[in-house]
């Protein structure tokens, strides 16, 4: 029972984690304009892995994709690669783990095969989580470096009367989503690996034990794991949690005369 619960929980945690990694990768707010100790601008800048956006006080938001591949910083390319590898490994891991779940029967699949598949998916989840954490951390490091460089630039070259405000960027929401999601995927992977140990058949396999008592011969066959857990045949008491969250953008927009095409 504990093994199945561990496997099921590992799968769910990994599923949430991978969904988070996908969400983080797609999000535009990897870096957001630093508003602290900065003149109050009526324009808010934020950037993602795929495009940069500008939101005006009017509510008009313009996003521009990074249409160049060679012109992008190597670090950004590396982060993209890490996140994509994380998503791909996680997706494959999810696919494998579905078939490895103890509560799902596919033909006459042996427990040893399920154990191997559970271990494989667990390793994939661990690597996927590590890729996401590494990707987000590399981007965060890049931000910190650029932040202090731009801070230094803010106080230099101001001999003249005219000042140029340097836009500094700080951690965006996507970084935190990525870290949490990567951590969840990692934890899910570890749980799958733990479940794998419980799923693997014991080396000493007692097929049947005979007891001879008072002239009657009774053979006792130890029941398989399925018989003791209630999983396998009875799946009617599964609970499905369907949570939904809505967010509403509270920025102001402007009349139809300025509809952006």
């Amino acid at each position: 029972m504990a093994v199945t619960a561990c496997q099921g929980l590992g799968f769910v945690v990994s599923l949430i984690g991978i969904a988070g990694i996908i969400a983080a990768t797609c999000m535009d707010q990897w870096s957001t304009q630093d508003l602290y100790n900065n003149p109050v601008t009526a324009v808010f800048n934020y950037q993602g892995l795929w495009r940069s956006c500008v939101r005006e006080s009017s509510g008009f938001t313009e996003c521009r994709g990074y249409f160049t591949l060679l012109g992008l910083p190597a670090m950004l390319q590396a982060v993209r690669a890490l996140m994509i590898v994380g998503i791909v490994l996680g997706a494959i891991g999810l696919l494998v783990s579905i078939f490895a779940l103890k509560c799902i029967r596919i033909g006459s699949m042996e427990d040893s095969a399920k154990a191997n598949m559970t271990l494989t998916s667990g390793i994939m989840f661990i690597v996927s989580g590590l890729c996401a954490i590494a990707g987000v951390s590399v981007f965060a490091n890049m931000l910190v470096t650029n932040f202090w460089m731009s801070t230094a630039n803010m106080y230099t070259g101001m001999g003249g009367m005219v000042q140029t405000v340097q836009t500094r960027y700080t951690f965006g929401a996507a970084l935190f989503v990525g870290w949490v999601a990567g951590g969840l995927t990692l934890i899910g992977g570890v749980m799958m690996c733990i479940a794998c140990r419980g799923l693997a058949p014991e080396e000493t396999n007692y097929k049947a034990v005979s007891y001879h008592a008072s002239g009657h011969s009774v053979a006792y066959k130890p029941g398989g794991f399925k018989a003791s857990t209630g999983f396998g045949s009875n799946t009617k008491n599964k609970k499905i949690y369907d949570g939904g969250a809505r967010t509403e953008d509270e920025v102001q927009s402007y009349p139809s005369k300025h509809d952006y095409v």
Epitope: A42, V43, V54, E250, V251, Y254, K257
Partner: antibody, heavy 118, light 113 residues
Framework: QIQLVQSGSELKKPGESVKVSCKAS????????MNWVRQAPGQGLEWMGW????????TYADGFTGRFVFSSDTSARTAYLQISSLKAEDTAVYFC???????????WGQGTLVTVSS | DIVMTQSPDFLAVSLGERATINCKSS????????????LTWYQQKPGQPPKLLIY???TRDSGVPDRFSGSGSGTDFTLTISSLQAEDVAVYYC?????????FGPGTKVDIK
């Protein structure tokens, strides 16, 4: 089409209060922020601030905090500018305007002349 | 606050001639995020509210004749009327639309010579 219609001229005594209204039509009122601009007789334009008509949050320019209050009534599709403890130097034409691309003031009301005289 | 200065204060140009108004801001109005300058130009005729002419320093608003053009970047901007018409007699204001508060320039009065 989009229109901003302001209340009529006001003649007030120093120390009194005035409430200028700006009724919007032709668009969803809560989607668009409302700005207020002052123009003293024969003078230039002075941006007073703006109100986010969705959240009700206001941003005031320096010199327009305290006596000046922006508000809005969603159901009436109207934005208000209230000035308390009026002074002679508050005599001006007050405009309401909505934001457009590039944070520009795209649509303007016709203006409301507030005269403060003893 | 950002200080906006305009030159000249008054400009008299013959009909059909070019009119050029300059505007300078105390800080750069260029946003690095989209490489756009948040500088707006307005036209105000006597007894009327101001009318939006140009936003993002060089983008004409819909319905604005193409004889009006804006240029410049950072702190120095220009509004050009390529061929002055009688209906162009007005006061022209530039405005910082990047930093709060949105400050206006003192205005340039354009008249016919």
């Amino acid at each position: 089409q989009i229109q901003l219609v302001q209340s009529g001229s006001e003649l007030k005594k120093p120390g009194e209060s005035v409430k200028v209204s700006c009724k919007a039509s032709g668009y969803t009122f809560t989607n668009y922020g409302m700005n207020w601009v002052r123009q003293a007789p024969g003078q230039g334009l002075e941006w007073m601030g703006w109100i986010n008509t969705y959240t009700g949050e206001s941003t005031y320019a320096d010199g327009f905090t305290g006596r000046f209050v922006f508000s809005s009534d969603t159901s009436a599709r109207t934005a208000y500018l209230q000035i308390s403890s009026l002074k002679a130097e508050d005599t001006a034409v007050y405009f309401c305007a909505t934001l457009g691309y590039g944070n520009s003031l795209a649509y303007w009301g016709q203006g409301t002349l507030v005269t403060v005289s003893s | 606050d950002i200080v906006m200065t305009q030159s000249p204060d008054f400009l008299a140009v013959s009909l059909g001639e070019r009119a050029t108004i300059n505007c300078k801001s105390s800080q750069s109005l260029l946003n690095s995020g989209n490489q756009k300058n948040y500088l707006t130009w307005y036209q105000q005729k006597p007894g009327q509210p101001p009318k939006l002419l140009i936003y993002w320093a060089s983008t004409r608003d819909s319905g604005v004749p193409d004889r009006f053009s804006g240029s410049g970047s950072g702190t120095d901007f220009t509004l050009t009327i390529s061929s002055l018409q009688a209906e162009d007699v007005a006061v022209y204001y530039c405005q910082n639309a990047y930093f709060y508060p949105f400050t206006f320039g003192p205005g340039t009065k354009v008249d016919i010579k």
